[in-house]
């Protein structure tokens, strides 16, 4: 009986994702075989959050405007171990939307969830950022320094990642 | 090649306003913020405040609050400021300058006198 | 605001004289140190920018350096054209602000 209405209780949990999310792919948590948690097929998962590399090119607005209807937003990228599980999806020769904005182009960039932005955790490439006409950041591939954040024009197409909260059901 | 062309000198009495006028050409205009630097006689340079060409929105230092307002129209390339309420403090050349990379503005304006007399 | 000093308001140099010129910010600027030139007609140009790039089409006899608060301008071969005021500027935050310039004499 216990068993029965556990089960119930994940079917309607995903039926609520399914009009974004036809299909999820779940693995279990733990010892507890009651802790499953999910992200939407065929995106990746990192610690407690989904991801998904858009490779439509998109403005930053129409990009955040894409991961919303997927139940996401522009990634907003916490630590350097995040970031370095994110690159292994990116190709060198692309640059990616982030969640990541100045739209007063006054220097006080924002996250789009509303995470303080911590100069101490952020990775632009040297001399980065450095003009008041670029609003919007990206994520890039430089031959000298790696992977790391670049500001550009915000109406340019670029491709983008997507962030989610993993599924738990 | 970049250019920057401003209106012509302007005398004008105290208390009324003036708008001068920087239209753009050789690049792509609403790529690139206009700001405004204001030179008294014989003194250092002051930076006024920044327009998006793009956007429309101002950024202006403190001290020019309320003394100025910045404009852009994009059909013809031209970026305005106009001075309200004006003083001899005014008296002053304005140049525009375009923004560039690095915080910096990268091409200026031949200035534009604005004489404030009675 | 960040101020910005030129403790030498006027140089006098002869040419082919090598001359530096100081700039000193009220806090650290994190390298977004510009110089301009502007000629006796008003005429402003960049220079340098980021503290040592050359803008282009300036002449290499240019140069700056720096780091943190202190920054100088050098002109290794001067030329009877560099006569003229010179303003370093930050734009590591707004409002952006200059120096007071230094002009910049023939002996």
């Known amino acids: 009986n216990f068993m029965y209405s556990k089960t119930v209780k994940r079917l309607s949990k995903l039926r609520e994702y399914q009009q974004y999310h036809p299909s999820l792919t779940c693995v279990m948590e733990g010892k507890d075989i009651e802790d499953w948690s999910c992200c939407p097929t065929p995106w990746t998962s990192f610690q407690s959050s989904c991801y998904f590399i858009s490779t439509g090119m998109q403005s930053w607005t129409k990009s955040q405007k894409n991961c919303s209807v997927m139940g996401a937003d522009l990634v907003v990228i916490n630590t350097r171990e995040e970031q370095d599980f994110i690159i292994q999806n990116l190709k060198r020769n692309s640059s990616y939307f982030l969640g990541l904005s100045d739209p007063g182009g006054r220097r006080h960039w924002q996250w789009v969830d509303q995470t303080p932005y911590n100069e101490n955790v952020t990775f632009w490439h040297s001399g980065e950022p450095n003009n008041l006409d670029e609003r919007c950041a990206i994520i890039n591939f430089r031959s000298s320094e790696e992977w790391g954040w670049n500001d550009i024009h915000c109406h340019v197409p670029q491709k983008s990642i997507c962030k989610m909260k993993k599924i738990y059901i | 090649q970049v250019q920057l062309q401003q209106s012509g000198a302007e005398v004008v009495k105290p208390g009324a306003s003036v708008k001068i006028s920087c239209k753009g050409s050789g690049y792509t205009f609403t790529d690139y913020s206009m700001h405004w630097v204001k030179q008294a006689h014989a003194k250092s340079l002051e930076w006024i405040g920044v327009?998006?060409?793009?956007?429309?929105?101002?950024n202006y230092n403190q001290k020019f609050k309320g003394k100025v307002t910045m404009t852009v129209d994009k059909s013809s390339s031209t970026a305005y400021m106009e001075l309200s309420r004006l003083t001899s403090d005014d008296t002053a050349v304005y140049y525009c300058?375009?923004?560039?990379?690095?915080?910096?503005?990268?091409?200026w304006g031949q200035g534009t006198l604005v004489t404030v007399s009675s | 605001d960040i101020q910005m000093t030129q403790t030498t308001s006027s140089l006098s140099a002869s040419l082919g004289d090598r001359v530096t010129i100081s700039c000193r910010a009220s806090q650290d600027i994190s390298n977004y140190l510009n110089w301009y030139q502007q000629k006796p007609d008003g005429t402003v140009k960049l220079l340098i920018y980021?503290?040592?790039r050359l803008h282009s089409g300036v002449p290499s006899r240019f140069s700056g350096s720096g780091s943190g608060t202190d920054y100088s301008l050098t002109i290794s071969n001067l030329d009877q054209e560099d006569i003229a005021t010179y303003f370093c500027?930050?734009?590591?935050?707004?409002?952006?602000?200059f120096g007071g310039g230094t002009k910049l004499e023939i002996k």
């Open positions: 500027q930050q734009g590591n935050t707004l409002p952006w602000t």
């Open positions: 327009i998006s060409t793009y956007y429309g929105d101002s």
């Open positions: 980021y503290t040592s």
């Open positions: 300058a375009r923004n560039g990379n690095f915080y910096v503005m990268d091409y």
